[in-house]
């Protein structure tokens, strides 16, 4: 059989994104997300 | 365009108190989410803590919750940081930023404008 393996030599960065709730409607607070590899996941 | 003037900055001890000052120009202050960051020699520099526009939401960093309290007075153009509980490993350079609204406030580089810091230094 066959073994597959990833291995691109890329590291995927991760970022860790907050935004303030009020900037983009009326409610209080922060919003948390995650960014890996440029793309918004959460 | 808003020019950052931080104050405030000393030696205290460690369980001490600071209260940090950054004064703003420019009338579009409150258009702006403020933050407080700092730069501890060999260290990256860190978000420490931000407010909205408004001064409704605040967010900080895990390991200044409890100790740190951030504020703003739209009517003075001045963002504030009180700092107590104070530990030498909150020795840095603290410095005030602004950014523009719809920015994740945690990001260093979305930042447009900044001051030229205060030191402040917790000795033990």
């Known amino acids: 059989d066959a073994e597959f393996r990833h291995d691109s030599g890329y590291e995927v960065h991760h970022q860790k994104l907050v935004f303030f709730a009020e900037d983009v409607g009326s409610n209080k607070g922060a919003i948390i997300g995650l960014m890996v590899g440029g793309v918004v996941i959460a | 365009e808003v020019q950052l003037v931080e104050s405030g900055g000393g030696l205290v001890q460690a369980g001490g108190s600071l209260r940090l000052s950054c004064a703003a120009s420019?009338?579009?202050?409150?258009?702006?989410?403020m933050a407080w960051f700092r730069h501890a020699p060999g260290k990256e520099r860190e978000f420490v803590a931000a407010i909205s526009r408004s001064g409704g939401s605040t967010y900080y960093v895990d390991s200044v919750k409890g100790r740190f309290t951030i504020s703003r007075d739209n009517a003075k153009n001045t963002v504030y940081l009180q700092m107590n509980s104070l530990k030498p490993e909150d020795t840095a350079i603290y410095y005030c930023?602004?950014?523009?609204?719809?920015?994740?406030?945690?990001?260093?580089?979305?930042?447009?404008?900044w001051g030229q810091g205060t030191q402040v230094t917790v000795s033990s």
């Open positions: 930023a602004a950014a523009p609204r719809g920015r994740s406030i945690v990001t260093t580089a979305t930042y447009d404008y």
């Open positions: 420019g009338r579009t202050f409150s258009t702006y989410n």
